[in-house]
Interface confidence: medium
């Protein structure tokens, strides 16, 4: 979590003298309790939306408004402390608005925005706005929280921003993943313009169950400049026993820009269908034998479906 | 490299299960499936199940009524534990690695294989049922 | 389940003879067997993997062909400490099943 370009942080408007400040997410109203505190905001929304760097990056910013309920407590209202926390982090960064001036009621409800809390791509926050001074204990609570979920980076908007392009997000490897028969996978997919290694993860699955039933790590080497966005095939031979016959095959890419934190894709083959009906037994007997052992390589129609989808 | 100890009572009661464990020394118990293996005197050797370290178990149909196996990936452990037991099931039991990697890189296209069977055993551990 | 069948079940051999042991499986089972050394008191040694590739560390002597139903360990040259007995194992499918091995003893 961090701020987008600490300069121009503003928040003065017409009728108001404002000053943006660090905020260590613990306010002075906490430890020394006023008598008079002001009444919580109201209509508190966030939205996604992106911004600049001065170095011309794009990055996805929370954009947090709200307003001011129409009562005779803006005359106490001191500021206010916005709040961000990631939830898988629990890491929180604050900022405060310091009201230089007293506010005073007009014709317009008072409204204040900020864009400048930098997120992350597929990160879910709790954004919150105190008002301040905060309220004393057991007092009526002056804050409002809303959650905020940033969408990934195949979200056509996001895929754009420095952070998403930083971790691969233009490659599309087109994965195509083929049951040749019951033992063999082949995997094809195409590479990058970028000469790194690769790493294809597998992990199989039994048909019904989650419990992995084989993992494997397979290493590619880095492409030769030539070999740029062609095509790459991997046959994987399995032993398919033990009914472990549901694949996921997921790509992971090394790219300079993101290294062990590059997004991965991933396709899934599931297994066989099973006929609903048991085949009849024939009233005849066959004049030839199959040769030993081919009678254990399955047909076309053994082929498991394969899907397509991404994983970060 | 790695090494299989197998360890638990070498005397259990009829009708009372088999409890051994079966230490991985040298390595991880990661990746790899871990079998339990029996071989009673003067007889063959019976597959009894395996394991994957994720916890996925595979058992002999003639045992399956009767067997738990379990594994400990903290402790690089996993155990046999065989229920009702009777003076048939008196044998060596041994704990075995089941699983071998190969890589083949050409231009452009790459193989891998994975081999099932057991490479690594434990010494074995006699296990005697007897009132 | 898949049966195994060793032929023979006993032979008697001399240093230096070239000795063949036969596996047969029930049904095809592709090239999913392994070979192993057993001799008393300890446990089996893995020679050979996927019908023919030789387990590290084995001597060359050791060998093995087969596909699908019938396979073969040969010793091209029998050392003394090869007299043990050898099983064969299929893992192609559940539940795994060895033959019931062959003691090479001495003649």
């Known amino acids: 979590l961090r701020l987008l370009d600490h300069r121009a942080l503003v928040c003065s408007q017409p009728g108001l003298n404002c000053t943006v400040k660090n905020s260590t997410c613990l306010d002075d109203s906490w430890i020394h309790p006023r008598n008079l505190t002001p009444s919580s905001p109201k209509d508190l929304q966030i939205q996604l939306h992106f911004a600049h760097t001065q170095q011309g990056d794009l990055f996805p910013v929370a954009h947090i408004e709200w307003t001011l309920q129409t009562d005779a407590s803006i005359l106490y209202l001191e500021g206010a402390e916005l709040s961000v926390l990631q939830l898988n982090t629990n890491e929180r960064l604050c900022v405060r608005f310091e009201f230089l001036s007293k506010l005073r009621h007009h014709h317009r409800r008072w409204r204040f925005t900020f864009s400048h809390f930098v997120v992350d791509p597929d990160q879910e926050y709790e954004v919150t706005v105190h008002h301040l001074p905060k309220p004393i204990p057991d007092g009526d609570p002056n804050h409002q929280s809303k959650n905020f979920l940033v969408p990934d980076c195949e979200h056509a908007r996001m895929k754009v921003t420095t952070p998403c392009m930083s971790s691969g997000s233009l490659w599309d490897p087109n994965i195509t993943v083929e049951t040749l028969d019951t033992q063999h996978l082949r995997v094809d997919f195409t590479l990058w313009n970028e000469s790194t290694h690769y790493q294809i993860l597998l992990t199989s699955f039994p048909h019904m169950e989650n419990h992995s039933c084989f993992e494997h790590m397979h290493h590619i080497p880095a492409p030769r400049p030539e070999e740029f966005h062609q095509r790459s095939n991997v046959t994987l031979t399995l032993r398919n026993l033990k009914g472990c016959c549901r694949h996921q095959v997921q790509i992971q890419p090394f790219f300079s820009s993101c290294l062990n934190d590059c997004l991965r894709h991933s396709a899934t083959v599931s297994c066989p269908e099973m006929p609903d009906t048991p085949e009849p037994i024939p009233d005849y007997m066959p004049l030839w034998e199959p040769r030993s052992g081919s009678s254990d390589y399955k047909d076309d129609d053994d082929k498991g479906s394969s899907h397509h989808h991404h994983h970060h | 490299q790695v090494q299989l100890q197998e360890s638990g009572p070498g005397l259990v009661k009829p009708s009372e299960t088999l409890s051994l464990t079966c230490t991985v020394s040298g390595g991880s118990i990661s990746n790899y499936y871990w079998n339990w293996i029996r071989q009673s005197p003067g007889k063959g050797l019976e597959w009894i199940g395996d394991i994957y370290y994720s916890g996925s178990t595979n058992y002999n149909p003639s045992l399956k009524s009767r067997v738990t196996i379990s594994v400990d990936t903290s402790k690089n452990q996993f155990s046999l534990k065989l229920s009702s037991v009777t003076t048939a099931d008196t044998a060596v039991y041994y704990c075995?690695?089941?699983?071998?990697?190969?890589?083949?890189?050409?231009?452009?296209?790459?193989?891998?294989?994975?081999?099932?069977?057991?490479?690594?055993w434990g010494q074995g551990t006699t296990v005697t049922v007897s009132s | 389940d898949i049966l195994m069948t060793q032929s023979p079940s006993s032979l008697s051999a001399s240093v230096g003879d070239r000795v063949t042991i036969t596996c047969r499986a029930s049904?095809?089972?592709?090239?999913?067997l392994g070979w192993y050394q057993q001799k008393p008191g300890k446990a089996p040694k893995r020679l050979i993997y996927?019908?023919?590739s030789l387990q590290s560390g084995v001597p060359s002597r050791f060998s093995g062909s087969g596909s699908g139903t019938e396979f073969t360990l040969t010793i091209s040259s029998l050392q003394p400490e090869d007299f043990a007995t050898y099983y064969c194992l299929q893992h192609n499918s559940n539940p795994f099943t060895f033959g019931p091995g062959t003691k090479v003893d001495i003649k």
């Open positions: 049904q095809g089972i592709r090239n999913d």
């Open positions: 075995a690695r089941d699983g071998e990697l190969a890589n083949y890189y050409g231009s452009g296209s790459y193989q891998f294989y994975y081999y099932y069977g057991m490479d690594v």
């Open positions: 996927a019908a023919s």
